[in-house]
């Protein structure tokens, strides 16, 4: 599965779209910063078989899609950019799903690491809770946008490891 070449391009486009989505300068939102506890260890890729790594990436993108598909999200971001963002995420999900199908039967290990998937979900639950507590304020969304950009940027490291595993 030649995931990384198609996928990393889409990842970079996703980052650029997210960068353009900003509505308020982060300089104005310093007080709203929050440590969501990004599960870095789940994206280190050392302990994973390829299929498990792909499933973790898939979960992160799926959760991001869910987060930005809410009514509150639609009211916050530019519609055109949001549509572009959805398109890129959808493309990445398709790439990953196709890749996962190719991995079926290739490895003896399970296709997904349930603990890792749960860890990613809990991370997104913390983000959702933060937004709720902050009443979906512009600065809260700015903090979340920056966090998701950072997580996409860090997940690129896992993609690099997958490329080297090819």
């Amino acid at each position: 599965c030649d995931l990384p070449q198609t996928h990393s391009l889409s990842n970079r486009r996703t980052l650029m779209i997210m960068a353009q989505m900003g509505r308020i300068s982060p300089f104005s939102c310093l007080k709203d910063r929050h440590d969501f506890g990004f599960p870095q260890e789940e994206f280190d890729g050392n302990q994973f078989q390829k299929a498990q790594a792909i499933s973790v990436l898939h979960e992160m993108i799926q959760q991001t899609f869910n987060l930005f598909s809410t009514k509150d999200s639609s009211a916050t971001w530019d519609e055109t950019l949001l549509d572009k963002f959805y398109t890129e995420l959808y493309q990445q999900l398709n790439d990953l799903e196709a890749c996962m199908m190719q991995e079926v039967g290739v490895e003896d290990t399970p296709l997904m690491n349930v603990d890792s998937i749960l860890t990613v979900r809990k991370y997104f639950q913390r983000i959702t809770l933060y937004l709720t507590e902050k009443k979906y304020s512009p600065c809260a969304w700015e903090v979340v946008r920056a966090e998701i950009m950072r997580s996409f940027s860090l997940s690129a490291n896992l993609q690099e490891r997958l490329r080297r595993k090819e």
């Epitope: 980052l15 900003g22 940027s153």
Partner: antibody, heavy 121, light 107 residues
């Protein structure tokens, strides 16, 4: 390899303006913040303001509001700081400093070499 | 604006000494404090961020601690290259503000 290269030293008359440039390399220019920090001779550090190129709009310290303009040109990966109505107390070394990519602009991770601006009649 | 006050403003020490510099904020800044080292004619260099996290490439003899309003930078065993001026900086809110600096000189 991240690098910030600033324009050369300037000597200016009181009342005039100065524009200092900062050319960045390494990383995606549009998506990280660049701040300007100045240091008067023998004095401490003072944050003037900052910009995230993709936003276009800058944030300024109240002290410099109305006198400083920070801009960024994405096509050349260059940030600019223009200070107007110069007075002798504006004599200082002006630094551009880069914040980490995809992070909040809270710490100055990389610095330019500094540009000495001397205001003298 | 948040005022940052460093003490002492200067100190003399010998190679191998343990050196402590303190920084006090005029209001609580959680752990949003950074430390920089500056040598004459050079740009500052980030040492510690978020009060206690060591910047990549910085020797482990440098450490930071504190939260709220009181913070400390410690150099466990002073080396010849550590003679410089040290600044704290709050990143809790804009304007980002620095302490006035602490000059570490050779005794």
């Amino acid at each position: 390899q991240v690098q910030l290269v600033q324009s050369g030293a300037e000597v200016k008359k009181p009342g005039s303006s100065v524009k200092v440039s900062c050319k960045a390399s390494g990383g995606t220019f549009s998506s990280y913040a660049i701040s300007w920090v100045r240091q008067a001779p023998g004095q401490g550090l003072e944050w003037m303001g900052g910009i995230i190129p993709i936003f276009g709009t800058a944030n300024y310290a109240q002290k410099f509001q109305g006198r400083v303009t920070i801009t960024a040109d994405e096509s050349t990966s260059t940030a600019y700081m223009e200070l107007s109505s110069l007075r002798s107390e504006d004599t200082a070394v002006y630094y551009c400093a880069r914040h980490l990519e995809y992070a909040f602009p809270d710490k100055f991770d990389y610095w330019g070499q500094g540009t000495l601006v001397t205001v003298s009649s | 604006d948040i005022q940052m006050t460093q003490s002492p403003s200067s100190l003399s020490a010998s190679v191998g000494d343990r050196v402590t510099i303190t920084c006090r904020a005029s209001q609580s800044i959680s752990s949003y404090l950074n430390w920089y080292q500056q040598k004459p004619g050079k740009a500052p260099k980030l040492l510690i961020y978020f009060a206690s996290s060591l910047q990549s490439g910085v020797p482990s003899r440098f450490s930071g601690s504190g939260s709220g309003t009181d913070f400390t930078l410690t150099i466990s065993s002073l080396q010849p290259e550590d003679f410089a001026t040290y600044y704290c900086q709050q990143s809790y809110s804009t304007p980002l503000t620095f302490g006035q600096g602490t000059k570490v000189e050779i005794k």
